[in-house]
């Protein structure tokens, strides 16, 4: 399955939207800094089968969509930018879903190693726990926005490697 060029463009647009969403300076939130430990190992290695890489990317985007789709998120961010973000993420999910169905099942057998997906889920669980702990404060959301940008930047590297493999 070849990821369309539009997928890379969508990824770039998502990064731009996340940057535009910034409401306060991260420097004013230094006391709220937190190590969520993005599972970088899941994005660095070349041991990935294509099916696994696509599924991990899908999980990151799905979890990001879920995170910004909450009631608390709609209070924290500009609604117009949020709507654009939903559209971009939704399109990327569609692109990846088409590929997942082709890649994951071969001859009726799933080829997936679930470890990486679980690691990504735990990472987003830590983000949700942090927001709850910080009572969804503006600084907590800003820390999370910056963190999601970092995770998208890492997943972009995996996307590029996928494109080179095609």
């Amino acid at each position: 399955c070849d990821l369309p060029q539009t997928h890379s463009l969508g990824h770039r647009r998502t990064m731009m939207l996340l940057a535009q969403m910034r409401r306060i300076s991260l420097f004013s939130c230094l006391k709220d800094r937190h190590d969520f430990r993005f599972p970088q190992e899941e994005f660095d290695g070349n041991q990935f089968q294509k099916a696994e890489a696509i599924s991990v990317l899908h999980e990151v985007i799905q979890q990001t969509f879920n995170l910004f789709s909450t009631k608390d998120s709609s209070v924290a961010w500009d609604e117009r930018l949020l709507d654009k973000l939903y559209t971009e993420l939704y399109q990327q999910l569609n692109d990846l879903e088409a590929c997942v169905m082709q890649e994951v099942w071969v001859g009726g057998t799933p080829l997936m190693n679930e470890d990486s997906i679980l690691a990504v889920r735990k990472y987003f669980q830590r983000i949700t726990l942090y927001l709850t702990e910080k009572k969804y404060s503006p600084c907590a959301w800003e820390v999370v926005r910056a963190e999601i940008m970092r995770s998208f930047s890492s997943s972009r590297n995996l996307q590029e490697r996928l494109r080179r493999k095609e």
């Epitope: 937190h34 679930e114 990486s116």
Partner: antibody, heavy 122, light 107 residues
Framework: EMQLMESGGGLVQPGGSLRLSCVAS????????MSWVRQAPGKGLEWVAS????????YYAPSVKGRFSISRDNSNNTLYVQMNSLGVEDTAFYYC???????????????WGQGTLVIVST | DIRVTQSPSSLSASVGDRVSISCQTS??????LNWYQQRPGKGPQLLIS???TLQSGVPSRFSGSGSGTDFILTIISLQPEDSASYYC?????????FGQGTKVEIK
């Protein structure tokens, strides 16, 4: 009865290599992440590495990254750690440990082996 | 990496005493703080997971409390077999980190 049995420890020269093994029994090995934790004689505990239930999601302590490699064979219920470029600071009891979840983080180390001693010395 | 600070490093108490060991982390670990007991010459054993969940087979005189960055292990009525080293460990993120340990001796 749940059990973890380490083997492969011994005396090795600085710069040398060693491979430790751990055979698990009494639980569904393939369902849980596994770790290695070490303890220098008379000192505290130091986590070394972890591997996910299916052999993915490998994590390492900064002190061993690039030198140690963790792996597992679910068909034989066995956990391994390949240790290269060993230094005197790697001298310790090495414990094989079961985690409470399928991948590392947000869990606990709920079952420990008896440990195997690795001595790095000239 | 998350730093884990445990205190005291050692304590001596009498049978029946109430004993508390403190553990602090350099950032919030939510509830993902575990406590281990290590008797001399043995491997560690998990006593309490997720700050306050007592493991099966562990006597009810042991209890854990706390969340975020501050945690406490309490032994309500110290028994001779509790003579051991106790370690706290954050299981929130890797690298997992342990406290320096607390050696508990019976007077």
């Amino acid at each position: 009865e749940m059990q973890l049995m380490e083997s492969g420890g011994g005396l090795v020269q600085p710069g040398g290599s060693l491979r430790l093994s751990c055979v698990a029994s009494g639980f569904t090995f393939k369902s849980f992440a596994m770790s290695w934790v070490r303890q220098a004689p008379g000192k505290g505990l130091e986590w070394v590495a972890s591997v996910g239930s299916q052999g993915g999601s490998k994590y390492y302590a900064p002190s061993v990254k690039g030198r140690f490699s963790i792996s597992r064979d679910n068909s034989n219920n066995t956990l391994y750690v390949q240790m290269n470029s060993l230094g005197v600071e790697d001298t310790a009891f090495y414990y094989c440990v079961k985690e409470t979840d399928a991948v590392a983080t947000m869990d606990a180390l709920d079952m420990w082996g008896q440990g195997t001693l690795v001595i790095v010395s000239t | 990496d998350i730093r884990v600070t445990q205190s005291p490093s050692s304590l001596s108490a009498s049978v029946g005493d109430r004993v508390s060991i403190s553990c602090q982390t350099s950032q919030s670990v939510n509830i993902y703080l575990n406590w281990y007991q290590q008797r001399p010459g043995k491997g560690p054993q998990l006593l309490i997971s997720a700050a306050s969940t007592l493991q099966s087979g562990v006597p009810s005189r042991f209890s854990g409390s706390g969340s975020g960055t501050d945690f406490i292990l309490t032994i309500i009525s110290l028994q001779p077999e509790d003579s051991a080293s106790y370690y706290c460990q954050q299981g929130y993120i890797t690298p997992y980190t342990f406290g320096q340990g607390t050696k508990v001796e019976i007077k």
